[in-house]
Interface confidence: medium
Amino acid sequence: SEVEYRAEVGQNAYLPCFYTPAAPGNLVPVCWGKGACPVFECGNVVLRTDERDVNYWTSRYWLNGDFRKGDVSLTIENVTLADSGIYCCRIQIPGIMNDEKFNLKLVIKPAKVTPAPTRQRDFTAAFPRMLTTRGHGPAETQTLGSLPDINLTQISTLANELRDSRLANDLRDSGATIRIG
């Protein structure tokens, strides 16, 4: 099941995701998508990086940490209830079936009405970076190059999900999709 994170309407949400670059500057492509991690790539991409830089992003989604050191945690600015749902962090580690995939569930709560202004308490406070859940820790990378970003391990379960949600439904970008690099 997905790891759950919470934020209030109007706050910034923080979704942790990390890897350890094999060497400084040896970056691994990463994508963030709305919806559960498919087998390849990300569905409904909101941000992605390549071996050098962030090469695609959408408004309100950004990397607050030092992504060059492997902190690819996603910050979603000024969240609304519509931001609730599953998010996929996919670390596209080169090598056969080496992709790291993390599904993070974001729950947005209505803003509390408070009599006096208080310091904003966002995800960073509620979920400090060091307290990431199992599976979100460092993923050692070995080599870089033109190697596959394929991970077949989810096809079985996701294929079942696809069947359950009707394959004829255009295999649209949803939580039950499969994608290739």
Epitope: E41, T58, I96, S146, D149, L152, I155, S156, R179, I180
Partner: antibody, heavy 116, light 106 residues
């Protein structure tokens, strides 16, 4: 070296079936999925489907469900495409391809001709 | 499902630069791959993940991807570059190809 070798050309009558094979060599077969691509005469490339070589699970593109079946024989590192109830519009070259970042290895193609 | 739009044909003078485009809604959010197909041959991957060249592909081939357009650039075009070129993305588990562009080297 890494290669995919497909079976030879086929001439079939409408309503018949055909099974195209794709034998992989030079790499660990079940470390990669296998995809199939169709190219009708004078037309572009059309993605048909994918099979997980570890589990046999399949994904088919719209338009390639029902009559089209992807299968495996992992003991001989071979993927298969079977088409039943052949129609004239199934006349095409059928390619198998290995997906990594893109499809980096392709078979030479198998021409299937459906004619009465 | 993504729809990828390519010009049916592009001409380039020998030694000049050819640019083949692949249009798609917000294609910049996806990884785009390019294939070269010569008559009677299987396709060959020439660019993967927007701008990366597989080993054996000349440096003359390069790619970019931003916004709603991905571009394959072939510099110092040679007669041997004459072929059909296809862009491709993965969308909801299914592969999607552009309609293909026939490159003619004059």
């Amino acid at each position: 070296q890494v290669q995919l070798v497909q079976s030879g050309s086929e001439l079939k009558k409408p309503g018949a079936s055909v099974k195209v094979s794709c034998k992989a060599s030079g790499y660990t077969f079940n470390n990669y999925a296998m995809t199939w691509v169709r190219q009708a005469p004078g037309q572009g490339l059309e993605w048909m489907g994918l099979i997980n070589t570890k589990t046999g699970d399949t994904i088919y593109a719209q338009g390639f469900t029902g009559r089209f079946v992807l299968s495996l024989d992992t003991s001989v590192s071979t993927a298969y495409l079977q088409i039943s109830s052949l129609k004239a519009e199934d006349t095409a070259i059928y390619y198998c391809a290995r997906p990594t970042y893109g499809m980096d290895v392709w078979g030479q193609g198998t021409t299937v001709t459906v004619s009465s | 499902q993504s729809v990828l739009t390519q010009p049916p044909s592009v001409s380039v003078a020998l030694g000049q630069t050819a640019r083949i485009t692949c249009g798609g809604n917000n294609i910049g959010s996806k990884n785009v791959h390019w294939y070269q197909q010569k008559p009677g041959q299987a396709p060959v991957l020439v660019i993967y993940r927007d701008s990366n060249r597989p080993s054996g592909i000349p440096e003359r081939f390069s790619g970019s991807n931003s916004g709603n357009t991905a571009t394959l650039t072939i510099s110092r075009a040679q007669a041997g570059d004459e072929a059909d070129y296809y862009c491709q993305v993965w969308d909801s588990s299914t592969g999607v190809f552009g309609g293909g562009t026939k490159l003619t080297v004059l």
